[in-house]
């Protein structure tokens, strides 16, 4: 297993509709054709997997049907969007990138993006 650098923004504020987007960029040491991206959430010293997708370079990211994540890739960048977020989902969202094929296997873990989600005040048709 070889290490790889992964960069992501330090802070992102979710929209009033509970949507947060950020870019996860990795320094690919070679020409990977199969990449796996995993989003982890760290809160209260617990780490949980939010979503994961494997994609072939040049193709769309495919998350599971019931995933709260969507994404697109462009070169060594992955644009991730997480939806359905509310204040209790505030936390550190860590981007983990694995270069699965061809060998050698590379693993990179970002420092995390702190996503802040704010509960709106009671008002007509606001998003919570």
């Amino acid at each position: 297993c070889k290490a790889m650098h992964v960069a992501q923004p330090a802070v992102v504020l979710a929209s009033s509709r509970g949507i947060a987007s950020f870019v996860c960029e990795y320094a690919s040491p070679g020409k990977a054709t199969e990449v796996r991206v995993t989003v982890l959430r760290q809160a209260d010293s617990q780490v949980t997997e939010v979503c994961a997708a494997t994609y072939m370079m040049g193709n769309e990211l495919t998350f599971l049907d019931d995933s709260i994540c969507t994404g697109t890739s462009s070169g060594n960048q992955v644009n991730l969007t997480i939806q359905g977020l509310r204040a209790m989902d505030t936390g550190l969202y860590i981007c983990k990138v694995e270069l699965m094929y061809p060998p050698p296997y590379y693993l990179g873990i970002g420092n995390g993006t702190q996503i802040y989600v704010i509960d709106p005040e009671p008002c007509p048709d606001s998003d919570f």
């Epitope: 949980t48 049907d65 989902d89």
Partner: antibody, heavy 123, light 107 residues
Framework: QVQLVQSGAEVQKPGASVKVSCKAS????????MHWVRQAPGQGLEWMGI????????NYAQKFLGRVTMTRDTSTSTVYMELSGLRSEDTAVYYC????????????????WGQGTLVTVSS | DIQLTQSPSSLSASVGDRVTITCRVS??????LNWYRQKPGEIPKLLIY???SLQSGVPSRFSGSGSGTDFTLTISSLQPEDIATYYC?????????FGQGTKLEIK
């Protein structure tokens, strides 16, 4: 096991207020949102509002703005729904239901409901 | 306000039939939709969340699909205990509006 236990049936006069309680047990109270949903006799489900027991913030359906107040008491793991200016069309069964944050592992929304509280508004 | 419209409002089917209920939403909600079953005199029970995730303990004859504005609940083989009213609901964002319900009866 998870339980949401609501207060008993109420009969109120038009113009009065009613306060229904929902006591949670079997899970971490402040880790789940709580909703209030009502159902008039023979009618469908109607969402009233949501409260975050952690911070106490709430959000209400437009229809109930100015008439409903949702509060919580973390010391007793209880949420309250108070509806004022009661009218006959407020006669309904009122339910509380819990709702985890979307990132909670194996968390499903509205997975547990209270048994319901019948509020009758009659002169 | 966001509107959820279920169709049909009521339907009658035979035991063993494949039954489909649809829910149309007035704006794009991605996959953030729940389905419930409410039997007469009982509290609502969550069947499907996030459009297609089967809630724990719910029989596999229930399935959900759809995204955006059009969603479907399917019962692959209707059972007598499925006599109930079924509701869709927008979730994870206020207002958490319900559809008007679909009353399912056995022929």
């Amino acid at each position: 096991q998870v339980q949401l236990v609501q207060s008993g049936a109420e009969v109120q006069k038009p113009g009065a207020s009613v306060k229904v309680s929902c006591k949670a047990s079997g899970y971490t109270f402040t880790s789940y949102y709580m909703h209030w949903v009502r159902q008039a006799p023979g009618q469908g489900l109607e969402w009233m509002g949501i409260i975050n027991p952690s911070g106490g913030s709430s959000n209400y359906a437009q229809k109930f703005l100015g008439r409903v107040t949702m509060t919580r008491d973390t010391s007793t793991s209880t949420v309250y729904m108070e509806l004022s200016g009661l009218r006959s069309e407020d006669t309904a069964v009122y339910y509380c239901a819990r709702d985890p944050p979307i990132t909670m592992v194996r968390g499903a929304p509205f997975d547990y409901w209270g048994q319901g509280t019948l509020v009758t508004v009659s002169s | 306000d966001i509107q959820l419209t279920q169709s049909p409002s009521s339907l009658s089917a035979s035991v063993g039939d494949r039954v489909t209920i649809t829910c149309r939403v007035s704006q794009d909600i991605s996959r953030l939709l729940n389905w419930y079953r409410q039997k007469p005199g009982e509290i609502p029970k969550l069947l499907i969340y996030r459009a297609s995730s089967l809630q724990s303990g719910v029989p596999s004859r229930f399935s959900g699909s759809g995204s955006g504005t059009d969603f479907t609940l399917t019962i692959s083989s209707l059972q007598p205990e499925d006599i109930a009213t079924y509701y869709c609901q927008r979730t994870y964002s206020a207002p958490y509006t319900f559809g008007q319900g679909t009353k399912l009866e056995i022929k």
